[in-house]
């Protein structure tokens, strides 16, 4: 079975440092895959970030960027500028 | 700014090993992965491997499995290499470098001098 | 492992001209999802570690001029620096990350002629 594992639980964040979330596949290459990364909210709202061929939701592009580590089978979120509004659960997930 | 400050150059003879120290300051030491590579006199550049600092997880190059080993003191944001059964041919300079971004190393330590010589 | 091989291994340039310098890969660096080639530069001067000029083929990093760009794609890469300054005499090296083990190319030296 395939697993993404997320590589820190926590995060802390320097607003304005940019910061790297990162998911590692586990059983299967992740070129088999597209990435997909989301966040969670006070109340339990799950937002889309990114999907893979760069494809962002509304108000995520300027701020984050998704890409993928071929060699070492990562899923990786980059945000760019953090601010307070960015704080949240950030969950990758990955479809075919 | 970001900074990684390596130790001082070594002079080893063959079949010892050496330790080399690279202290990081200026960002998240445990956010990002650092690699060693390695120049040999008047050459290119060779990969050596790399640590996870966060979790310690490491993945090295073929050619150094089992002489290599990189290890991490979180506490002081300091990542170690070091390289057993030293020969001739591991003279070189040894750099630490970080990856911000994904694979390509944004910043380089001074570069450590290490020689073998009998 | 991907073999990186750089042409010319020398070259001498007058200044405001153009260098350019070509790296091929043994195999395609390019991941189809992402469109994405996993190719750095680097410049190393004498006695300096290198420093990160390109990354994804094409992406120059913060700070470094204009002058120098990358192209290519799959396996076929170029760097152009597009007028020669005497600031720019160095080695130049090519790098791959699309797999373990990273490997660089053998190295350009570029002089003033």
């Known amino acids: 079975a395939i697993e993404l594992v997320p590589e820190h639980q926590t995060v802390p964040v320097s607003i304005g440092v940019p910061a790297t979330l990162r998911c590692s596949m586990k059983g299967e290459a992740i070129g088999n895959y597209y990435i997909n990364w989301y966040r969670k909210t006070q109340g339990n709202t799950m937002t889309f970030i990114y999907r893979e061929k760069d494809i962002y939701g509304p108000g995520f592009k300027d701020n984050f960027q998704g890409d993928i580590d071929i060699a070492k089978n990562l899923a990786v979120l980059k945000i760019l500028a953090p601010s307070e509004r960015d704080e949240g659960s950030y969950y990758c997930a990955c479809d075919t | 700014e970001v900074q990684l400050v390596q130790s001082g150059a070594e002079v080893k003879k063959p079949g010892a090993s050496v330790k080399v120290s690279c202290k990081a300051s200026?960002?998240?030491?445990?956010?990002?992965?650092l690699h060693w590579v390695r120049q040999a006199p008047g050459q290119g550049l060779e990969w050596v491997g790399w640590i996870n600092p966060s979790s310690g997880d490491t993945d090295y190059a073929q050619t150094f499995q089992g002489r290599v080993t990189m290890t991490r003191d979180t506490s002081i944001s300091t990542a170690y290499m070091e390289l057993s059964r030293l020969r001739s041919d591991d003279t070189a300079v040894y750099y630490c470098?970080?990856?911000?971004?994904?694979?390509?190393?944004?910043?380089w330590g001074q570069g450590t001098l290490v020689t073998v010589s009998s | 492992d991907i073999v990186m091989t750089q042409s010319p291994d020398s070259l001498a340039v007058s200044l405001g001209e153009r260098a350019t310098i070509n790296c091929k890969s043994s195999?395609?660096?390019?991941?189809?999802?992402?469109?994405?080639?996993?190719l750095g530069w680097y410049q190393q001067k004498p006695g300096q570690p290198p420093k990160l000029l390109i990354y994804?083929?094409?992406t120059r990093e913060s700070g470094v001029p204009d002058r120098f760009s990358g192209s290519g794609s799959g396996t076929d890469f170029t760097l152009t620096i597009s007028s020669l300054q005497a600031e720019d005499v160095a080695v130049y090296f090519c790098?791959?990350?699309?797999?373990?083990?990273?490997?660089f190319g053998q190295g350009t030296k570029v002089d003033i002629k």
């Open positions: 200026g960002y998240t030491f445990t956010g990002y992965y």
């Open positions: 470098a970080n990856e911000l971004g994904i694979g390509v190393f944004d910043y």
């Open positions: 994804w083929a094409s």
């Open positions: 195999q395609s660096v390019l991941y189809s999802s992402n469109n994405k080639n996993y």
């Open positions: 790098q791959q990350y699309y797999s373990i083990p990273y490997t």
